[in-house]
């Protein structure tokens, strides 16, 4: 004969675990229901009753099945510099990401807590390595030959116009100025800009060390004072 | 240890001015970037102003754009920010950070700006 199937609540044989989607209550000591996600459990079982559950109130959530009294708390509105790709639901926490334009300087489970404006390279650095969602720019000094007049996320070193008669030579942060005669380049003229990074997921990567002579343009250091409590507001 | 200490807040009007500081120590505060970040009742972590470890590049938030000026005398290891023309959505609990390879990683404990009539 087939096993006959328990129903919710019942006493578990001795040293077997309840049935997926259920719990051992400790003070009814029976299996009873979890609660499906977007609700909670309003009413504990009993010997005789089953988990009463209900359904999250508006800005809380549950993203598991679960036996929990109160549902959790949906994250606070997305700040001006993020976006919210995933909205608040009754079954999920509202995640916000970066904007274009800013990186995520402070993480946290899901999304980001705090968003930072990319690093600019000023005049006389370019981009080594471009944003990403969760890493800043990256700046290096401009070789020899090359410049950057810009104070930019996006531009590189730009080769210096080969001029057939040089008026001012170039420098790091200014192109060399030719005479009247034409002058040749050995690369398309105009700004060059890096694309903007489309959204990402991926780790953290430790940017490679700058030359020691480029100074750190990072508005960001080593070990000290943590951040702020998630939801914290302070003494 | 790092330690980031900030002073300067308190309860000013609307319209009103207040100079916050942060004083660094435990590192070579000549060598890194600062921010300041705020955080409303209520509300999230908000960055508000950040400056370059030279000085030569600084960057605000849009919401304090020509009102708030960082500035930094490392001389005395310290980083300024003056708020001009408060706002009562300035009111938050303004926090001096800074951190290695674009995280913010640490921070001061905070100073309480409050801005009502």
């Known amino acids: 004969l087939p096993a006959q199937v328990a129903f919710t609540p019942y006493a578990p044989e001795p040293g077997s675990t309840c049935r997926l989607r259920e719990y051992y209550d400790q003070t009814a000591q029976m299996c009873c229901s979890k609660c499906s996600p977007g609700q909670h459990a309003k009413v504990f079982c009993t010997k005789t009753s089953d988990t009463v559950c209900d359904s999250c109130e508006d800005s809380t959530y549950t993203q598991l099945w679960n036996w929990v009294p109160e549902c959790l708390s949906c994250g606070s509105r997305c700040s001006s510099d993020q976006v919210e790709t995933q909205a608040c639901t009754r079954e999920q926490n509202r995640i916000c990401t970066c904007r274009p334009g800013w990186y995520c300087a402070l993480s946290k489970q899901e999304g980001c807590r705090l968003c930072a404006p990319l690093r600019k390279c000023r005049p006389g650095f370019g981009v080594a390595r471009p944003g990403t969602e969760t890493s800043d720019v990256v700046c290096k000094p401009c070789a020899p030959g090359t410049f950057s007049n810009t104070t930019s996320s996006t531009d590189i070193c730009r080769p210096h116009q080969i001029c057939n008669v040089v008026a001012i030579p170039g420098n790091a942060s200014m192109d060399a100025v030719c005479t009247s005669t034409s002058p040749t380049r050995s690369m398309a003229p105009g700004a060059v800009h890096l694309p903007q990074p489309v959204s990402t997921r991926s780790q953290h990567t430790q940017p490679t060390p700058e030359p020691s002579t480029a100074p750190s343009t990072s508005f960001l250091l080593p070990m000290g004072p943590s951040p702020p409590a998630e939801g914290s507001t302070g003494d | 240890d790092v330690q980031l200490v900030e002073s300067g807040g308190g309860l000013v009007q609307p319209g009103g001015s207040l100079r916050l500081s942060c004083g660094g120590s435990g590192f070579t505060f000549s060598s890194y970037g600062m921010s300041w970040v705020r955080q409303a009742p209520g509300k999230g972590l908000e960055w508000v102003s950040g400056?370059?470890?030279?000085?030569?590049?600084?960057d605000y938030a849009d919401s304090v754009k020509g009102r708030f000026t960082i500035s930094r005398d490392d001389a005395k290891n310290t980083v300024y920010l003056q708020m001009n023309s408060l706002k009562s959505e300035d009111t938050a609990l303004y926090y001096c950070a800074t951190g290695e390879d674009g995280e913010l990683n640490y921070w001061g404990q905070g100073t309480q700006v409050t801005v009502s009539s």
């Open positions: 400056i370059y470890d030279d000085g030569s590049v600084t």
